[in-house]
Amino acid sequence: KAMHVAQPAVVLANSRGTASFVCEYASPGKATEVRVTVLRQADSQVTEVCAATYMMGNELTFLDDSICTGTSSGNQVNLTIQGLRAMDTGLYICKVELMYPPPYYMGIGNGTQIYVIDPEPCPDSDF
C-alpha cells in the first residue's frame, strides 16, 4: 500500500547554480490532485525548499518567488532548483502526496545529494 518515490542519488549543479532531477512515484490509486514538495535535510534538520500542487494532466506551478520550477508527465516530475551556492550542497528529498481523491497517500524519496561548486571568479585579463 505504500507509495514508492524514486529520485537520483547524486546530481551536480551546473556553473550557474542550477540543478535538475526527476522525481518519479508509483501511484497506488488514481490521483487527480498531487502535491510535490522538495525538502532539504542537513544535520537531521529538515526544511522546505519549495512545493507545488498540480492537477494530473496540468502543468506544475510553483509560487512566483520560488527557486524551483518543474514539469509533470504522468507519475513523473522534472524538478529544477535555481540559484544554488556551494553552501546549499546537501540532500534534497522529494515528497509526494496524493491529495485527492481519498485515500491520501504520502511517499518520500531517499533524497538526491546535490553538489554545488561556486564558479571561480574570472581573472583580470589584458586586451
Epitope: 500500500k1 497506488p28 502535491r35 514538495t37 529538515v46 522546505e48 512545493a51 500542487t53 491529495m99 504520502m106
Partner: antibody, heavy 118, light 108 residues
Amino acid sequence: QVQLVESGGGVVQPGRSLRLSCAASGFTFSSYTMHWVRQAPGKGLEWVTFISYDGSNKHYADSVKGRFTVSRDNSKNTLYLQMNSLRAEDTAIYYCARTGWLGPFDYWGQGTLVTVSS
Amino acid sequence: EIVLTQSPGTLSLSPGERATLSCRASQSVSSSFLAWYQQKPGQAPRLLIYGASSRATGIPDRFSGSGSGTDFTLTISRLEPEDFAVYYCQQYGSSPWTFGQGTKVEIK
C-alpha cells in the same frame, strides 16, 4: 517556538453542536497539513480528521463522517472542528496536531475536553 | 485500513531495566511511515521516533526504534523514572491514519 492551543470544549447534550478551535503560532501555518486526534477517557488515540495546506482537501474517520467538518483560516492561523449531531461516544479530549515535513505528528496541542451527556 | 496491534498491553519493569515494546501491522507498512509517541497522564502525546528509527528532536538516545514490513519495535535501553508512561505506534503513510492501542510501561 511552535504552539498549538485548543479551545471550545465543554459539556453538550446529545444531538447538539460544538465548534473547536486550534490557534497556531511559531510557524508558517499555511505550509503544514493539520489533524484532529481524540482520546476517550482512559482509552487510546483515535485519528479524527485531516486538512490540507489550503483547506481544499479533507479526510475523515468513518466514525465522524457526515457529522464533523474540519476547516482552517490561514489568515488567522487557526484550525477548526465543527461537530454536529454529537453522540455520547464522541466524549473525548480533542487534540490538534501538526504534520511534520516527513509525515509524523510532530507537535500537539494540550487538548480540549468535550463531554456529550444529557 | 491498517490495523496496528501493540504488545504487551502492560509492561512492569524497574528503573534501569530494558523495555522492549512491539507493534505489529495488519499489512506491510513502509518503515518511512511508522512513528512512536509517548504520553504521560494529563499530557498530550509527544513524538519520540519517526521513520521507524529516527529520533525526534530532543529525544534521548536511550530510545531507539527498529523494524520493517509488519513488525516494529521500540526499545528503551535503561528506563529512567520519567519514562514510565503509555507508548503508541502510528502509521502515517496513508489514510486513515491509525494508532496502536498503546503499551503502558509501569513501575514494578
